[in-house]
């Protein structure tokens, strides 16, 4: 379950990204094909949904923030790809405050979709507890929607 006990550092700025080396047999960095990206998205979807549903159950009545926009898709590629560079520090930051098991699995998948040497920009979340909860909810909702969008693009005909 997600909870938030005070200010932490999170990431929002999203950069174009792809994959990391896993082994000597794996394709070099940024070179995973759409088929493998689709596999990773399929792994991420239930993790993201579960995290969001748990948070919504725990934090009932928290509204979505209208000041947070997760620009999670690349605009310079077809099909659009997931930008993970700024999502990663967000999940790294909430890890101590959340379900570490789920967060670790999400981080593991996002790492595979990240440029090897891409910097991870950090931003401050609102200090106000209620605004923090709203910020987290918005990120989780938009992340889930982003995954759905990428998955649909990978399913819609030739890559």
């Amino acid at each position: 379950m997600l909870s938030h006990t005070g200010p932490s550092r999170f990431a929002l700025f999203l950069l174009c990204s792809m994959e990391t080396l896993l082994s000597s047999h794996m394709a070099p960095t940024h070179q995973l094909p759409p088929s493998d990206v689709r596999k990773i998205i399929l792994e991420l979807q239930p993790l993201s949904r579960g995290l969001l549903e748990d948070y919504q159950k725990k934090e009932t009545g928290v509204p979505e923030s209208n000041r947070t926009l997760l620009l999670c898709l690349t605009s310079d590629s077809q099909p659009p790809r997931l930008n993970s560079s700024a999502i990663l520090p967000y999940f790294r930051a909430i890890r101590p405050l959340s379900d570490k098991n789920i967060i670790d699995k999400i981080i593991e998948q996002l790492d595979k979709l990240k440029f090897q040497h891409e910097p991870e920009t950090e931003i401050s979340v609102p200090a106000d507890t209620f605004e923090c909860k709203s910020f987290i909810l918005t990120i989780l909702q938009q992340f889930s929607a982003c995954l759905e969008s990428v998955f649909k693009s990978l399913n819609s005909g030739p890559q």
Epitope: E19, A27, H30, Q31, P33, S35, K39, L42, P158, Q159
Partner: antibody, heavy 118, light 111 residues
């Protein structure tokens, strides 16, 4: 060394369900992607689908309405079920491992021949 | 689906000579300069065996007589020199896009 072994009935009647088991040794099915492929009598190979290390499945759209891949991690086995079979499903069925992103299917079972006939 | 067309369907080569098998994809299987095309050998009564991954990388334990080349839509498997043990059917396979697909196979025989 990684080894895969298919097992199941060699004869299935039309409209029935084809059920096969892939037993894996030398690796855990809780890592990598575990696939089913079949080879028709005319030598054509068809990719059927996979079950992932986490239990996520994905299927060839041409089979989606009939196929199910499941697993039993305690036995290190995964399974293929193909419903409503016809004579067109007569083939040799292989299980195979896809171990790393960007790589290829590096370990295959020896295959099991299945005939669909009444 | 990406269609892979192999040619020739069968090939007879003298021992010690070169065998060349072609695989053409209906669309590019490249991303960021990597080609997601692989080659398998299947001997009679056996399962497919990985020879070449990502167009040109020799799988561990495979003799250097086997080689792969090509990019985008056109790929080649070369066996030089051919040995008696190479009698088999050879398949190309793409893992660029779902569903993964295979070529129709090329049967290699000794002349």
């Amino acid at each position: 060394e990684v080894q895969l072994q298919e097992s199941g009935p060699s004869l299935v009647k039309p409209s029935q369900t084809l059920s096969l088991t892939c037993s894996v040794t030398g690796d855990s099915i809780t890592s990598g992607y575990w696939n089913w492929i079949r080879k028709f009598p005319g030598n054509k190979l068809e990719y059927m689908g996979y079950i992932s290390y986490s239990g996520i499945t994905d299927y060839n759209p041409s089979l989606k309405s009939r196929i199910s891949i499941t697993r039993d991690t305690s036995k290190n086995q995964y399974y293929l079920q193909l419903n409503s079979v016809t004579t067109e499903d007569t083939a040799t069925y292989y299980c195979a491992r896809y171990g790393n992103y960007g790589y290829a299917m590096d370990y295959w079972g020896q295959g099991t021949s299945v005939t669909v006939s009444s | 689906d990406i269609v892979l067309t192999q040619s020739p369907a069968s090939l007879a080569v003298s021992l010690g000579q070169r065998a060349t098998i072609s695989c053409r994809a209906s669309e590019s299987v490249d991303t960021y300069g990597n080609s997601f095309m692989h080659w398998y050998q299947q001997k009679s009564g056996q399962s497919p065996k990985l020879l070449i991954y990502r167009a040109s990388n020799l799988e561990s334990g495979i003799p250097a007589r086997f080689g792969g080349s090509g990019s985008r839509t056109d790929f080649t498997l070369t066996i030089d020199p051919v040995e008696a043990d190479d009698v088999a059917t050879y398949y190309c396979q793409q893992s660029y896009e779902d569903p993964w697909t295979f070529g129709g196979g090329t049967k290699l025989e000794i002349k």
